[in-house]
Interface confidence: low
């Protein structure tokens, strides 16, 4: 046998090249045949009325057409054939890759709630072979369930991916990102998720710097409230009590002017959304005005635990008076 | 050459903050997800967070949030660290990030953190 | 919290095989990577997508992922793959992160 051929693979549209090689020529006849097995090249004469077929080549040793424009119908086995003595027959597989005509990325919603779980589809449509789908949210891959269907010769997928969202998830894109022989470098579709959640209360004291509140001094605080969507209620109470007379609110800021040790106690910031509700509490405690001219030294201590809650602890250096805790966050 | 380069660790006492900088060669920072990861001495590696390239969003381990901040520049991606203390004593590496696989490191700065 | 564990330290024979595990409650469900890192330098991609070696990296190298279990097989051991491994995975279902490294493996090459 000194007739050669190679398979070749081709993405549906281009130029699928077909080649017979001759070893040892002897000036015997070549010809090459479709999957019909219709002569498309006698020699140098095209016989098939089909002009997307060119001659590339035409020797004693090899005849070498090109086909443009491949569709998928084009695929199959074409004949070299070599009239010698016994003839020789060798054929070539032509393999057609299709890619995906259409990628689409559906979100169950346009807008989820944290803790929600939301599914999101995506659909590879009509590609050979089969697509594959890869799932991920911002740079973390995710595992996806994919559904094949088949028509034709032709592939459609769709990958369902569950997702459990939350807060940090917010503005955060979900990929999907397609592999596919047809396809070179990134063929991808996302989506950014936009997550609602409840506010984060955090209660800032603005007045007195120093952190220790005397009597006679004056009092401001400052609720900060963050949420999606922006918390549209923030309201001050004072726990288990009436808020004090002489007390101003003014929108997020508390102000007490003249404390006096029946202003002690709790007082709570409140903030709400649609999503949901959140307080954070404030201890007031009113210490005696100053004896001496010098001011005590305060040491502040931060401590953030996983649940948020947010302790701030106030230490007076002078003999008798002992730390309270002033803010705890919920 | 792709490649990464940290800078700005030094040392400092505790709570100084501290502002690293991560400057690309070979590569256009903008096309890519980029991480943070740091390891003390004698430790493994910890990572830190994520700018990814599409929205500018950021993503935090846990222990960070709220202390460490990255941001990211056409040329360049820092990482702002407050509230230091001695546990942070560690070399920072910045990382490409494509798609959960860092696969261009610098060589990492060192911070080191003492009284 | 979501932990990958893998042993501390491992020795292996000059030229023999060994394998390096991470195991975590659900890394079935994840993708695993590995990176090698020599002392005083930055960490190198060895694997990803649990199987997958970017070019450049010796097919001496290969990963596996089943079960709770990913593995690196280092086959024909040699003296220049003294060094920490370190497996990661990212975990996309849960809110405080999506990227998390194991402890380390330091593996000696003796002979």
């Known amino acids: 046998q000194n007739l050669f051929t190679k398979d070749v693979t081709v993405i549906e549209g281009e130029v699928a090249t077909i080649s017979c090689q001759v070893n040892k020529s002897d000036d015997s006849v070549i010809q090459l045949l479709n999957p019909n097995r219709q002569t498309i090249y006698f020699r140098d004469f095209r016989p098939l009325k089909d002009s997307r077929f060119q001659l590339l080549n035409f020797s004693s040793s090899e005849l070498k057409v090109s086909l443009t424009n491949v569709s998928i119908s084009d695929e199959g086995r074409y004949f070299c054939q070599l009239y010698t003595d016994p003839p020789q027959e060798s054929y070539t597989t032509i393999t057609v890759l299709v890619p995906p005509r259409n990628l689409m990325i559906d979100i169950q919603k346009d807008t989820a709630v944290e803790g929600e779980e939301i599914e999101v589809n995506c659909t590879a449509m009509a590609s050979k072979p089969a697509t594959t789908i890869r799932w991920f949210k911002g740079n973390t891959e995710l595992k996806g369930k994919s559904e094949v269907e088949e028509w034709s010769d032709m592939y459609t997928v769709t990958s369902q991916l569950m997702l459990k969202v939350h807060k940090e998830d917010d503005g955060v894109p979900v990929i999907c990102q397609v592999e596919h022989p047809a396809v070179t470098g990134n063929l991808q579709t996302q989506r950014y998720l936009e997550v609602q959640y409840k506010p984060q209360v955090h209660i800032q004291m603005t007045y007195p710097l120093q952190g220790l509140t005397r009597e006679g001094d004056a009092l401001e605080l400052t609720c900060e409230a963050i949420g999606k969507p922006q918390p549209v209620m923030v309201t001050w109470v004072r726990v288990d009590d009436e808020m004090p007379q002489h007390a101003v609110l003014s929108g997020p800021n508390l102000f007490i002017n003249n404390l006096n040790k029946t202003d002690n106690g709790t007082y709570r910031c409140e903030a709400s959304n649609i999503v949901g509700k959140a307080h954070s509490d404030y201890m007031l405690y009113v210490y005696d005005p100053p004896t001496t001219i010098p001011p005590p030294t305060t040491t502040t201590t931060t401590t953030t635990t996983t649940t948020t809650t947010i302790l701030t602890i106030i230490t007076d250096s002078r003999a008798g008076e002992e730390g309270s805790i002033r803010a705890v966050d919920h | 050459q792709e490649q990464l380069v940290e800078s700005g660790g030094r040392l400092v006492t505790p709570g100084t903050p501290l502002t690293l900088t991560c400057k690309a060669s070979g590569f256009s920072l903008g096309k890519y997800d980029m991480s943070w990861v740091r390891q003390a001495p004698g430790k493994g590696l910890e990572w830190i967070g994520t700018?990814?390239?599409?929205?500018?969003s950021t993503w935090y381990a846990s222990w960070a949030k709220g202390r460490f901040t990255i941001s990211k520049t056409s040329t360049t991606v820092d990482l702002k660290m407050t509230s230091l203390t001695t546990e942070d004593t560690a070399t920072y590496f910045c990382a490409r990030d494509f798609l959960g696989v860092n696969s261009i490191w610098g060589p990492g700065t060192l911070v080191t953190i003492s009284s | 919290s979501f932990v990958l564990t893998q042993p501390a330290s491992v020795q292996v024979n000059l030229g023999q095989t060994v394998s390096l595990t991470c195991t975590a409650d659900?890394?079935?469900?994840?993708?695993a990577s590995w990176y090698q890192q020599k002392p005083d330098q930055a960490p190198v991609l060895l694997i990803h997508?649990?199987?997958s070696r970017p070019s450049g990296v010796p097919d001496r190298f290969s990963g596996s992922n089943s079960g709770n279990t990913a593995t690196l097989t280092i086959s024909g051991a040699q003296a220049g793959d003294e060094a920490d491994y370190y497996c990661a995975t990212s975990d996309g279902s849960g809110s405080n992160f999506h990227f998390v490294f194991g402890g380390g493996t330091q593996l000696t090459v003796t002979g």
């Open positions: 700018i990814y390239a599409g929205s500018g």
């Open positions: 659900t890394l079935s469900r994840s993708y």
């Open positions: 997508r649990d199987t």
